[in-house]
């Protein structure tokens, strides 16, 4: 039940892209503050964002310790200026978040086409391997490092003069596609984790077209 002048947080929502993970909730505080705790299913609670008036808390540092674990968070409500005050049961008011498994649920960020190079009737398109905040041996891992072959990229490519999009797929960060000589093509890529049932796809990368400075053309 809690004290009469605090309300429990509600609409606890995980917002996560490429493992950058923020817990959001409502309401905007009026004469109250919040503290967040996070734990794995079997672990101890760790407090974050102490006595904040924000309605979000960045939990990235905690979840990147093991992205395959399932996490639970809870948001405590305290009266402003009297954080020792507790509810009628002797505990501050709190609300639990939904469970969150970063590896299965983090959204895939918008990919970027790093470069493309044409050699005759072949074009090699390279996707930037985006850095995440997941660390191993004190270095930040890339998206490919974390997901390995679970992550594929779909390339959409089309003649500048036409609308139909052909597709190619790769479980590396490179595509090698056949093109018609003398035609300019445009490209867009999408990250996909086919083994997922939700949050399977990223938004599309910005479109890059031949004849612009990202690419290189070599006639063989």
């Amino acid at each position: 039940s809690g004290t009469t002048n605090t309300v429990a947080a509600y609409n606890l929502t995980w917002k996560s892209t490429n493992f950058k993970t923020i817990l959001e909730w409502e309401p905007k505080p009026v004469n109250q503050v919040y503290t967040v705790q996070i734990s794995t299913k079997s672990g101890d609670w760790k407090s974050k964002c102490f006595y904040t008036t924000d309605t979000e808390c960045d939990l990235t540092d905690e979840i990147v310790k093991d992205v395959k674990q399932t996490y639970l968070a809870r948001v405590f409500s305290y009266p402003a200026g009297n954080v020792e005050s507790t509810g009628s049961a002797g505990e501050p008011l709190y609300e639990n978040s939904p469970e969150f498994t970063p590896y299965l649920e983090t959204n895939l960020g918008q990919p970027t086409i790093q470069s493309f190079e044409q050699v005759g009737t072949k074009v090699n398109v390279t996707v930037e391997d985006e850095r995440t905040l997941v660390r191993r041996n004190n270095t930040f891992l890339s998206l490919r490092d974390v997901f390995g072959k679970d992550l594929i990229y779909t390339l959409y490519y089309w003649k500048s003069s036409s609308s139909g999009k052909k597709t190619a797929k790769t479980n590396t960060n490179e595509f090698l596609i056949d093109v018609d000589k003398g035609e300019n093509y445009c490209f867009s890529v999408q990250a996909v984790i086919p083994s997922r049932t939700v949050n399977r796809k990223s938004t599309d990368s910005p479109v890059e077209c031949m004849g612009q400075e990202k690419g290189e053309f070599r006639e063989i």
Epitope: I152, Y156, G164, K165, K166, T167, K169, R200, D204
Partner: antibody, heavy 120, light 107 residues
Amino acid sequence: EVQLVESGGGLVQPGGSLRLSCAASGFTISDYVIHWVRQAPGKGLEWVGYIDPSNGYTYYADSVKGRFTISADTSKNTAYLQMNSLRAEDTAVYYCARDPQSLTSPFDYWGQGTLVTVSS
Amino acid sequence: DIQMTQSPSSLSASVGDRVTITCRASQDVNTAVAWYQQKPGKAPKLLIYSASFLYSGVPSRFSGSRSGTDFTLTISSLQPEDFATYYCQQHYTTPPTFGQGTKVEIK
């Protein structure tokens, strides 16, 4: 349970139009790619075209290009095949199928099909 | 477009027979070949993906293999419910293309 249900088939005159629907349940179409495949009576399977509902990208078989248009309404979780300037050779059972977009990416679920007959 | 040439177009066999159907791609398609089974009045059903992987729920008497651009579907011991038409499909490039089909009939 994943399900695809086609509807909208029927008898139409040459030169006429028809719109087929493919209603999906058990998954969100914007997370997948949806294909249309047809089968003329007593014949084999012919790919018609695809749509990626997440971005609206499409591609069509040469035999239908300029006459058929695939679209999707993600709020209704439904894909559509708009068929214009229909010809006798478009007579077929039309199937929609789900593509999980994996590297091995075959069509893992198909609808039951809807028959389109083009005849005067 | 990549052509998938399937043979034979039909075959007669008895229950318990070993049946082999082949598909040849007109160019390299890596392992991006699937096999489907279709019964009259029904939609195709996925049997094999990535040339040799058995799809979930498909009996182990079905198998697939690849040698270069040649792909084979084998039914080790034909069962009464296996009498149907079988199609190969490449999904390596757009447009995806199907073989012409092989009808497996009762001898």
